[in-house]
Every structure is written in C-alpha cells, then in structure tokens.
C-alpha cells in the first residue's frame, strides 16, 4: 500500500499480497435479476449493458439462469467467492470462463457459473464441451 | 519518473459538482488503464471508476453511477473524474492509479504508481 495511504483495520476493499501489492477489483455485468430469453442455447450473452467494479477486490463474477413454468431469467452480479451465493459454493470462481453449472432447486431448474474475468458473465456457456481444461 | 498528479478538489455542498485532473508524466499513458479511487477518512479505500486506454470504455462502482463521469485526454496524458450531485459520503481523498489491462495485481506495494491525492469536502 502506498506510504500515503492510510491502513485501515478490517479493511476488506484492499487486497494485498505479502509484498503489498495490490489486487484490482473484478469488472462484471451487474444487472441483477432480468428477464431473459436464453433457452436451449450452447451459449448465451447476458444483455446486461451495466459493467460494474466489483465493490471487493475478492469478489468474482456470477451469472444465475432460472427457469420455471412462468418465465426465464439472467442474474449478473459481483460475489465474494468465500460467500454462498443461492445456497450454493462458488466452487469454480478461478475460472476465466462462466461455465453453467446445474443446481437441484425443487420447483426450477437452476444454473449458475462463476468466473474472474472482465465481465466474463456477459457470457454464458451451457455447452458440455466447455470444461475446466479447456485452455480457451 | 513517474508521476501522478491530481487536482481539482476542494469544499462543495451537497448537490454541487467538481472536476478532478490527474496530470500523468514518466509513462506511455495510452498503454494503461486508469482509475479513480478514493478513501474516506477513517475507512478503507473504494474504487469508484476506471476508463480503458482507447476506445475509453468506461466502469463505475454501483455507488457512483449516474454521477461521475470518468475521461482522459490521452493527448494531454490526463485523466479526469467529473462528479456531479454530491453527497457527504462521497467526502474522501481521490486517487489516481494506473493499471496494466489485463493484470490483476500491482508490480509493487505502490499500487504501480498512485498519486498523492486530492480532498473533496462535501458539507452545508
């Protein structure tokens, strides 16, 4: 941290490393809950026209489909990976890709992804071709 | 050497607006993105806006949106923070930063270089 910068205690808005540098925060979508017409894609973009600075540095980017007999929605947010978010563990925040993932939620079917990109949530992949060692 | 130099802040009552400048020297400005943050007294710092360095794509925290507008000349190697319909809250010492795009951590414990600040004061 810069000698002319206060430190503050508890102070989770700045991460640094053991040699004091710093993280910059994510860049995410962050539209909150939006209608979508997403539906049997392999991929989908958000349409969420909001770019959003992460308000903490370890947050990562989230996207959440849900489906139900009503309607179809997107949920773009920022979201401390440490955090349930839906109940559910952040379990693949590292990944530079959003890679949907399904979630038993009786009543919906449910998918959420989690990435730490720049506004890797604007893209949503449902493809099973996509995976985790998938270099791209 | 590089150098960050921000000015433009001052005392200004709730409603009213500032400029801010940050004045780059030392570095090939158009090869980095910029960022405004800020750090109320007393707390922790707050990143409030970031502009890319062409096409000047720009960010904001979900806090300011609406009201700051960020920009660069990149001419002028400046950066500049317009902050409209001001708060108390958005009372703090404003920061200018450089960030290589693309890397999520500083070279160093200097934040790759910040500037020395400038205060806003919002109060009646």
């Known amino acids: 941290i810069p000698p002319h910068v206060q430190k503050s205690v508890n102070n989770d808005m700045i991460v640094t490393d053991n040699n004091g540098a710093v993280k910059f925060p994510q860049l995410c979508k962050f539209c909150d809950v939006r209608f979508s017409t997403c539906d049997n894609q392999k991929s989908c973009m958000s349409n969420c026209s909001i770019t959003s600075i992460c308000e903490k540095p370890q947050e990562v980017c989230v996207a959440v489909w849900r489906k139900n007999d009503e309607n179809i929605t997107l949920e773009t947010v920022c979201h401390d990976p440490k955090l349930p978010y839906h109940d559910f563990i952040l379990e693949d925040a590292a990944s530079p890709k959003c890679i949907m993932k399904e979630k038993k939620k009786p009543g919906e079917t449910f998918f959420m992804c989690s990435c730490s990109s720049d506004e890797c949530n604007d893209n949503i992949i449902f493809s099973e071709e996509y995976n985790t060692s998938n270099p791209d | 050497e590089v150098q960050l130099l921000e000015s433009g802040g001052g005392l200004v009552q709730p409603g009213g607006s500032l400029r801010l400048s940050c004045a780059a020297s030392g570095f090939t400005f158009t090869e980095y993105r910029m960022w405004w943050v800020r750090q109320a007294p007393g707390k922790g710092l707050e990143w409030v806006s970031?502009?890319?360095?062409?096409?000047?794509?720009?960010y904001y925290a979900r806090s300011v949106m609406g009201r700051f507008t960020i920009s660069r000349d990149n001419s002028k190697n400046t950066l500049y923070l317009q902050m409209n319909s001001l708060r108390a809250e958005d009372t703090a010492v404003y920061y200018c930063a450089k960030q290589i795009p693309g890397r999520k951590w500083t070279a160093n414990s200097r934040f790759d270089y910040w500037g020395q600040g400038t205060l806003v004061t919002v109060s009646s």
């Open positions: 970031a502009i890319e360095p062409i096409g000047n794509r720009t």
